[in-house]
């Protein structure tokens, strides 16, 4: 059993998060998961899920009585998630720390919106996909 | 040229992100996303990036003298990002609007934790290939 | 070409009011959408308020409601944002924008700053 599972338990009672009720009016993200096969879709939205997640955390990271568990939880989806690569995780953590505020960070992004859309498409990579796609366009 | 070409341009005009100097000490986006060269990886960095710049826009939506620009921008990153896939951008921006301090969602979210975790490595989605996996380690 | 020239600015107790005017060259401000942005010291672009070209929309930010007023002088060309109420949060270089022709401007501001 991987360890994080005894730790979440640990969670449920802390969050008094166990209890059937928990789950009336839907899922937060299980359902979400359940639409997206492949595996593209599946990390844009697990992206989303495992920020939420460390913010969620981030909350609580003076919280003694729990600490233990949501390390190791984290250091769980560090493997699973970025695949125990460091600076994945890094690079993530950057990005999901940005302020929409701050001067410096507003003009950067407006600064290099045009070539954050221009990589947005996966055909947008190398010019050589793209051609082959053209030619598949008939 | 794409239509959100222009219209980022007049952003840059709007958040005076026009000048060379707004480069300096480094890029958010652009770096990042030179490090990752696999899609999947890909799509977990461009899913925070892609997150940043709706937040963003989300402060100027009734900015009239920018509605437009943040308009077609947004569709276009609907059509590059989400494929023009309009459950995709739902189920993104459910996930995106969920607050980490509301505490039936902490409860929902622990309560799926174990499954979510469960989820998070591309191995796990079905048994078959797990096990396939493993008979590549010996 | 469009011109976009702020002014009004200054320092303002707490309580106070002031109003900001913007003079507009090369379009006619009746026919646009124009609105007021702000940008406190050491932070990013905030938008403060709008108002469509037929004047019946009108918008503000919740930080200014109830406070700003953005209104438009057409025979003299002017969009005006009255400020009451300030506070020094409300400490900031205000600029107007508009749209003209598919093209965004934007003034070179005037400081207004809250300060007892």
């Known amino acids: 059993q991987d360890p994080y599972v005894k730790e979440a338990e640990n969670l449920k009672k802390y969050f008094n998060a166990g209890h059937s009720d928990v789950a009336d009016n839907g899922t937060l993200f299980l359902g979400i998961l359940k639409n997206w096969k492949e595996e593209s879709d599946r990390k844009i939205m697990q992206s989303q899920i495992v920020s939420f997640y460390f913010k969620l955390f981030k909350n609580f990271k003076d919280d003694q009585s729990i600490q233990k568990s949501v390390e190791t939880i984290k250091e769980d989806m560090n493997v699973k998630f970025f695949n125990s690569n460091k600076k994945k995780r890094d690079d993530f953590e950057k990005l999901t720390n940005y302020s929409v505020t701050d001067l410096n960070v507003q003009r950067k992004a407006i600064h290099e919106l045009i070539q954050v859309m221009a990589e947005l498409s996966p055909a947008a990579k190398t010019g050589k996909r793209k051609r082959s796609q053209m030619l598949f366009r008939g | 040229q794409d239509p959100y070409v222009k219209e980022a341009e007049n952003l840059k005009k709007y958040f005076n992100a026009g000048h060379s100097d707004v480069a300096d000490n480094g890029t958010l986006f652009l770096g990042i996303l030179k490090n990752w060269k696999e899609e999947s990886d890909r799509k977990i960095m461009q899913s925070q990036i892609v997150s940043f710049y709706f937040k963003l826009f989300k402060n100027f939506k009734d900015d009239q003298s920018i509605q437009k620009s943040v308009e077609t921008i947004k569709e276009d990153m609907n059509v590059k990002f989400f494929n023009s896939n309009k459950k995709k951008r739902d189920d993104f921006e459910k996930l995106t609007n969920y607050s980490v301090t509301d505490l039936n969602v902490q409860r929902k979210a622990i309560h799926e934790l174990i499954q979510v975790m469960a989820e998070l490595s591309p191995a796990a989605k079905t048994g078959k290939r797990k096990r396939s996996q493993m008979l590549f380690r010996g | 070409q469009v011109q976009l020239q702020e002014s009004g600015g200054g320092l303002v107790q707490p309580g106070g009011s002031l109003r900001l005017s913007c003079a507009a060259s090369?379009?006619?401000?009746?026919?646009?959408?124009m609105s007021w942005v702000r940008q406190p010291p050491g932070k990013g672009i905030e938008w403060v308020s709008s108002?469509?070209?037929?004047?019946?929309?009108?918008t503000y930010a919740d930080s200014v409601k109830g406070r700003f007023t953005i209104a438009r002088d057409n025979a003299n060309n002017i969009l005006y944002l009255q400020m009451n109420s300030l506070k020094p949060e409300d400490t900031a270089v205000y600029y107007c924008?508009?749209?003209?022709?598919?093209?965004?401007?934007r003034g070179q501001g005037t400081q207004v700053t809250v300060s007892s």
């Open positions: 090369g379009f006619t401000v009746s026919n646009y959408a």
């Open positions: 108002i469509n070209n037929r004047n019946d929309h009108i």
């Open positions: 924008a508009s749209r003209v022709d598919d093209r965004v401007s």
